[in-house]
């Protein structure tokens, strides 16, 4: 059974993940991003279901494509450092989903833009955090 300290740790990790995802979204989803139009042409796989921490497997599998798209945004105005950011996210995701059980991710039929993809995982984090608090 989860202890209060493990719940608190999970909550903090989710908040960190949420902040990272929001910062990425904030960095790209605005009119000042010169590469936004191009970035929106890339397609991401969305989870069929995302209600538990194990479903973060679906996010983990899309981190490499995410990094590649974020590399497009590099300019004097964008300080995302995709490699560092994705590496941080990867570490958090691995800790949160655990490595004991192997979960096969199921994807929805429809693909999504980077903005829809990030918003979906932001909503996931907010939803899990709200159940923990």
């Amino acid at each position: 059974a989860p202890t209060s300290s493990s719940t608190k740790k999970t909550q903090l990790q989710l908040e960190h993940l949420l902040l990272d995802l929001q910062m990425i979204l904030n960095g790209i989803n605005n009119y000042k991003n010169p590469k936004l139009t191009r970035m929106l042409t890339f397609k991401f796989y969305m989870p069929k279901k995302a209600t538990e921490l194990k479903h973060l497997q679906c996010l983990e599998e899309e981190l490499k494509p995410l990094e590649e798209v974020l590399n497009l945004a590099q300019s004097k105005n964008f300080h995302l450092r995709p490699r560092d950011l994705i590496s941080n996210i990867n570490v958090i995701v691995l800790e949160l989903k655990g490595s004991e059980t192997t979960f096969m991710c199921e994807y929805a039929d429809e693909t999504a833009t980077i903005v829809e993809f990030l918003n979906r995982w932001i909503t996931f984090c907010q939803s899990i955090i709200s159940t923990l608090t």
Epitope: L18, N26, K32, L80
Partner: antibody, heavy 126, light 111 residues
Framework: QVQLVESGGGVVQPGRSLRLSCAAS????????MHWVRQAPGKGLEWVAV????????YYADSVKGRFTISRDNSKNTLYLQMNSLRAEDTAVYYC???????????????????WGQGTLVTVSS | DIVMTQTPLSSPVTLGQPASISCRSS???????????LSWLQQRPGQPPRLLIY???NRFSGVPDRFSGSGAGTDFTLKISRVEAEDVGVYYC????????FGGGTKVEIK
Amino acid sequence: QVQLVESGGGVVQPGRSLRLSCAASGFTFSSYAMHWVRQAPGKGLEWVAVIWYDGINKYYADSVKGRFTISRDNSKNTLYLQMNSLRAEDTAVYYCARGSYYDSSGYYFGEDFDYWGQGTLVTVSS
Amino acid sequence: DIVMTQTPLSSPVTLGQPASISCRSSHNLLHSDGNTYLSWLQQRPGQPPRLLIYEISNRFSGVPDRFSGSGAGTDFTLKISRVEAEDVGVYYCMQVTQFPTFGGGTKVEIK
């Protein structure tokens, strides 16, 4: 001093078109992004569209996408909003507002929405 | 879209007394460039909006120092230290971290 003057508003029937203009003076128009914002009678503010300093990138609110077109003529220091397929819910005062400043290498800085025009009223009614 | 929620809807204040308006964002507004693009606008009756505060707490040129902004992340506040007659109007928070969105507005009126 910075001045933005909108024109082109009026009464128009649903389904018809209208073109708004915003004449800018007192600053280097070609170095700034520009926005259109609207305000329905007695309501709050709603962002409509933005255009980059060079006119290359344009973005729209979902409510006007596919119907409205933002453009600019830097030689005339003028911003435009072409409004097609107008609906009753487009009735509002339309404001132009100045966006971020871009330097010669495309680096942006400065405040968005720092100067606004007086607005022009568009009424869509049969 | 980022949703901006303002409270209160209306704020009746006595001349010379302080006033405070809150604004909450549905998303953290910290941009990857390190700035938080949260602004406050004032709209006097029959007038266009006017920029008061940008990037949470920076007063725009010509704005009296009785206006101040504070906050971080998702929660922001505009304070008027001593309300004057010319401060009557509607105040809007807005974010330009992503595509611009505005709060619903707070009407400041004299009691």
